[in-house]
């Protein structure tokens, strides 16, 4: 039985050329997290964080994606094309798979409000 829940940074906005932290948090379960996959809106993988082998950044993003903080992901040098949905998929044992969604809007303006449902330490 899957008892866990995923909290995410929800809908966020960031400035073009800047960076943003994509963060998910799995709670209310004792399941072991074996791997976290980060996907972009077109289902292309950005990065994988394997519990045993560590972080793996996909080649297309290796110059502008940084691992962390924690199981989160930092997306740098933002472009307008980065606007869209991002998904964190938690593969756990024995529960199975949990999935969270974040919507990122990249803004042209010089001032971008960066709002989140929970504070990132």
């Amino acid at each position: 039985m899957m008892t866990g829940t995923i909290e995410t940074t929800g809908n966020i906005s960031a400035k073009k050329g800047g960076s943003v932290i994509l963060q998910c948090h799995l709670s209310s379960t004792m399941a072991q997290v074996t791997q976290v996959n980060w996907e972009q809106h077109d289902h292309s993988l950005l990065a994988i964080r394997n519990a045993e082998l560590g972080w793996h950044i996909y080649p297309a993003f290796k110059d502008r994606v940084a691992p962390g903080p924690g199981l989160g992901l930092t997306l740098q040098s933002l472009t307008m094309n980065d606007t869209g949905e991002y998904f964190c998929t938690y593969h756990t044992y024995p529960d199975g798979t949990y999935r969270g969604r974040i919507f990122l809007e990249v803004l042209e303006s010089s001032v971008a409000e960066h709002s989140a449902r929970f504070q990132i330490p």
Partner: antibody
Framework: QVQLQESGPGLVKPSQTLSLTCTAS??????????WGWIRQPPGKGLEWIGS???????YYNPSLKSRVTISVDTSKNQFSLKLSSVTAADTAVYYC???????????????WGQGTMVTVSS | EIVLTQSPGTLSLSPGERATLSCRAS???????LAWYQQKPGQAPRLLIY???SRATGIPDRFSGSGSGTDFTLTISRLEPEDFAVYYC??????????FGGGTKVEIK
């Protein structure tokens, strides 16, 4: 579909270093989902995994061989290589390179293999 | 390390018969991490089954895999002449390291 081809000397002297290269064609080893591995098979015996590497250079090794093994990658040549030091007759085997789906979780396996190359350790 | 014990060592059967190959692990293995391979003389192994029960691309449906925990089975429902070969199971954990079973030879009776 990626194809893999091993190359290297077929004869190595005891105490020397065995060096093999695997060249990928029909696809890039700079793939996010796959590691690239080495497996060996002594004559008439079973299979033994040696180690695997990611395009970025991250590796994981068989602990029983780790002290003697180095696996490296050259994405510009679409190749990865194996070095096994201080070889003895016990290292005589067919050496295979293969695509390692360790990050694929429910598809973890070696799904594509080279044809293998025989390496004999003898003086 | 996880030791995979395959039995029997050799299976003598005739074409058309059913083959049942066993792979027993020394400790529990996630079924997601269990694979089966076929190897013919002078050839590289070929992936048959991954995730304990999923057939790899191009593998005929006479091959099936099952099992969980420490006991896994490869079944060939009706042996064809090209199926006579050596079969290996493999567990794909990182720590402890991935290992192969010792193999089962399926030979013509």
């Amino acid at each position: 579909q990626v194809q893999l081809q091993e190359s290297g000397p077929g004869l190595v002297k005891p105490s020397q270093t065995l060096s093999l290269t695997c060249t990928a064609s029909g696809g890039s080893i700079e793939s996010g989902l796959y590691y690239w591995g080495w497996i060996r098979q002594p004559p008439g015996k079973g299979l033994e995994w040696i180690g695997s590497i990611y395009y970025s250079g991250s590796t994981y090794y068989n602990p029983s061989l780790k002290s003697r093994v180095t696996i490296s990658v050259d994405t510009s040549k679409n190749q990865f290589s194996l070095k096994l030091s201080s070889v003895t007759a016990a290292d005589t085997a067919v050496y295979y390179c293969a695509r390692d789906g360790v990050l694929a979780l429910n598809k973890r396996s070696f799904d594509i293999w080279g044809q293998g190359t025989m390496v004999t350790v003898s003086s | 390390e996880i030791v995979l014990t395959q039995s029997p060592g050799t299976l003598s059967l005739s074409p058309g018969e059913r083959a049942t190959l066993s792979c027993r692990a020394s400790q529990s293995v996630s079924s997601s991490y269990l694979a089966w391979y076929q190897q013919k003389p002078g050839q590289a192994p070929r992936l048959l089954i991954y995730g304990a029960s999923s057939r790899a691309t191009g593998i005929p449906d006479r091959f099936s895999g099952s099992g969980s925990g420490t006991d896994f089975t490869l079944t060939i429902s009706r042996l064809e002449p090209e199926d006579f070969a050596v079969y290996y199971c493999q567990q794909h954990t990182v720590r402890p390291p991935l290992t192969f079973g010792g193999g089962t030879k399926v030979e013509i009776k």
